[in-house]
C-alpha cells in the first residue's frame, strides 16, 4: 500500500480563479473502511493502482485518502423540506494526482490519474447513513453507489430508499 505523503493539506479560497472550475471548501485526510471494519487499501501493481478491501494485521497502518468537499452550485431541495443548504459532493484521492473514478460501463471503481478540472466521474454525492456510516453516490449515475463486491470496490445500483442501508454500500471514515 502507498501512503499519502505526496498529498499536501492545503487551503484554497472558495472560488480560486487559478483553478478551472469549482474548488473544494474543505479538505482533510481520513482512512476508509467498510461497515464490517475491513480497510480500503491501495497498491501499485504492474504500473497501475489497484484497490483492495481487506483485513489489516494488528499494527498495520491504514491508507489515508484526501477527502475534498465541494458544494453543488444550486441548493438541493429534493426532499421538499425547504432545506437551504447546498448538496455536498466529495472526491477521494489516495495519492497525489490520482482520484477514485466511477466507471459506469464496467460497474467498477478505478483509480485514474488526471488534472483539474476533475471529470464528473470523480465526484460522489455524500450520504449520511446509520451508525456513523456514509455512502458515496455517483454524480454521473444517480442511484448507483460505491460498494463492496468480492473484496473489491464496485458500483452497486440501489433500487429503493429501503436499500440505502444495505451493508455493502456503507463506509466509515476515520482520522486516526
Amino acid at each position: 500500500a502507498f501512503g499519502i505523503s505526496g498529498v499536501q493539506k492545503y487551503t484554497r479560497a472558495l472560488h480560486d480563479s487559478s483553478i478551472t472550475g469549482i474548488s473544494p471548501i474543505t479538505e482533510y485526510l481520513a482512512s476508509l473502511s467498510t461497515y464490517n471494519d475491513q480497510s480500503i487499501t491501495f497498491a501499485l501493481e504492474d504500473e497501475s493502482y489497484e484497490i483492495y478491501v481487506e483485513d489489516l494485521k494488528k499494527d498495520e497502518k491504514k491508507d489515508k485518502v484526501l477527502l475534498s468537499y465541494y458544494e453543488s452550485q444550486h441548493p438541493s431541495n429534493e426532499s421538499g423540506d425547504g432545506v437551504d443548504g447546498k448538496m455536498l459532493m466529495v472526491t477521494l484521492s489516495p495519492t497525489k494526482d490520482f482520484w477514485l473514478h466511477a466507471n459506469n460501463k464496467e460497474h467498477s471503481v478505478e483509480l485514474h490519474k488526471c488534472e483539474k478540472p476533475l471529470p464528473d466521474q470523480a465526484f460522489f454525492v455524500l450520504h449520511n447513513m446509520h451508525s456513523n456510516c456514509v455512502s458515496f453516490e455517483c454524480k454521473t449515475d444517480p442511484g448507483v453507489f460505491i460498494g463492496v463486491k468480492d473484496n473489491h470496490l464496485a458500483l452497486i445500483k440501489v433500487d429503493s430508499s429501503e436499500n440505502l442501508c444495505t451493508e455493502n454500500i456503507l463506509f466509515k471514515l476515520s482520522e486516526t
Epitope: 471548501i25 474543505t26 482533510y28 485526510l29 481520513a30 468537499y69 458544494e71 438541493s76 429534493e78 426532499s79 421538499g80 423540506d81 432545506v83 437551504d84 443548504g85 447546498k86 448538496m87 455536498l88 454525492v125 455524500l126 450520504h127 449520511n128 447513513m129 456513523n132 456514509v134 455512502s135 440505502l164 471514515l173 476515520s174 482520522e175 486516526t176
Partner: nanobody, 121 residues
Amino acid sequence: QVQLVESGGGLVQPGGSLRLSCAASGSIRTVNYMGWHRQAPGKQLELVAVVTSGGGTNYADSVKGRFTISRDDTKNTVYLQMNSLRAEDTAVYYCNAAASTYSSTVVRSFWGQGTLVTVSS
C-alpha cells in the same frame, strides 16, 4: 432547516485573543464536520480550520500554532480559540457545517451569517 449562529467576534489588539463560537440548530441528524472560513476586505473566502465528527482537524498554514478548533458534539457547537492575533487576521469569520437532516440522507453545506473580528491597536 439548519441554522448556524456565530458569536464572539469583536475588536482586539495585536497579540490578543478571542474565542469564537458557532451553534448549529434545527433538524440535524448527523454532522460530518464543522469549520471556520474567513473573508478579509477585498480578499477571497478561505478555510481557517475544520474539525470532523471523528475529531480530526485541519488548519490553514497561516493560523497553525495560533488557532485551535474544538467541538462539543452534545451541543452541535464548534469553537475557534484565536491567540497571538495579527492585523492580517482581521476578517469576517463564517461558520460552515456539513450535515444531513431527518428528511434526507444527503449531506449539505450550511453557513452562518458571520462575525467580524478586527485586530487593531
